[in-house]
Amino acid sequence: QAGPLPKPTLWAEPGSVISWGNSVTIWCQGTLEAREYRLDKEESPAPWDRQNPLEPKNKARFSIPSMTEDYAGRYRCYYRSPVGWSQPSDPLELVMTGAYSKPTLSALPSPLVTSGKSVTLLCQSRSPMDTFLLIKERAAHPLLHLRSEHGAQQHQAEFPMSPVTSVHGGTYRCFSSHGFSHYLLSHPSDPLELIVSGSLEDPRPSPTRSVSTAAGPEDQPLMPTGSVPHSGLRRHWE
């Protein structure tokens, strides 16, 4: 053997963010020489599952018929060929939504904003949470975290945007979470359509899409500006 076996590729269908109760399939793709595929979950002491390869032997399927809290977490896969085990795949983070009640997303002062002005998206939860995530549909980098300092729990998080440009227009949702598991999120908030007027082109309304939908390469990342709000929350980029 000249060197370590190449690492397999690990992914989830229909995506890695799954609502409670929905099904998800984890795929591990290795090589045509694979004899067995193994899936490991972080902090699980035994191999999480193992499967024979599907013909033509270059991948294996790990099925989760109904998503629950127990399945949320960080996974890696391996394959075994006649010369031994491969390197681990890059990790797959499987996130479950629906663990907590949905927060409310609103725009201050209004979801209709003139280009160049400021707007703040406010995500509010009924019970105190320590992490809030803002998601813009069809964004290349959809997750923006605001996480509380020192585990202090908050009922809301502010996401200021200034100055607003046409790039900020679109459909947003937010989630809330507890820090003890980054992989368990609330139900999504109802969508909020942010409409930016006064730009050279009219904003295109975004169709409602599931958070597990892959972003297109042409979409722009969400880029809010301004200082971190005075709420004890710290901004984290994903």
Partner: antibody, heavy 124, light 107 residues
């Protein structure tokens, strides 16, 4: 010391079901998968299936998919196998056996400890 | 499924003898071959895993060798406590399969 203590012999009627138990001790129960193996009188060994005590994931031999159901109780460190719609072909000794990694950093997995076996006799 | 053919199905040997049991797989199993001992009372123990690695607590008179499809278990100096049935088992692909067994008796 690793021990797998299996439940006592069973005599059951055709068409009935039976649930066998396997209580593990001497190691961390969730760190090893549990396998079940069948041995008919005077014959070889047949692999029935395996279960991961951490998450209840199972893999079955196709031959036993509609015959055996594997479960675990993590709190008591016990694995179970239920056999349904029993016929004379199911009369056998059934073994539980733990499966895991051998060696500290080696990628070798094998069944390393076995229970004493449970005899099941199907008779009217 | 992979078929393992063990030979002989039974053999008689004298104490102190060197005994060899063979196991042939229906396809290459890449050394994922284990050997088990089943005593007359039904107790099953792992002897050797991955063709030649001795499991902890197993006497050094037991050894294993082979590659590809052909494997063997050797007992170099037969003792009374070795009277048992020996099974090979492949762990290369699911489902794991066993050989038919070799019953070892004293001459």
């Amino acid at each position: 010391e690793v021990q797998l203590e299996q439940s006592g012999a069973e005599v059951v009627k055709p068409g009935a079901s039976v649930k066998l138990s396997c209580k593990a001790s001497g190691y961390t129960f969730i760190s090893y998968w549990m396998h079940w193996v069948k041995q008919r009188p005077g014959q070889g060994l047949e692999w029935i299936g395996e279960i991961n005590p951490t998450n209840g994931r199972t893999n079955y031999n196709e031959k036993f998919k509609s015959k055996a159901t594997l479960t675990v109780d993590k709190s008591s460190g016990t694995a179970y196998m239920q056999l349904s719609s029993l016929t004379s072909e199911d009369s056998a000794v059934y073994y539980c056996a733990r499966w895991g990694q051998l060696g500290l950093r080696e990628g070798y997995y094998a069944v390393d400890y076995w229970g004493q076996g449970t005899s099941v006799t199907v008779s009217s | 499924d992979i078929v393992l053919t063990q030979s002989p199905s039974s053999l008689s040997a004298s104490l102190g003898d060197r005994v060899t049991i063979s196991c042939r797989a229906s396809q290459d199993i890449s050394n994922y071959l284990n050997w088990y001992q089943q005593n007359p009372n039904g107790t099953v123990k792992l002897l050797i895993y991955y063709t030649s690695r001795l499991h902890s607590g197993v006497p050094s008179r037991f050894s294993g060798s082979g590659s590809g499809t052909d494997y063997s278990l050797t007992i170099s100096n037969l003792e009374q406590e070795d009277i048992a049935t020996y099974f090979c088992q492949q762990g290369d692909t699911l489902p794991p399969t066993f050989g038919g067994g070799t019953k070892l008796e004293i001459k």
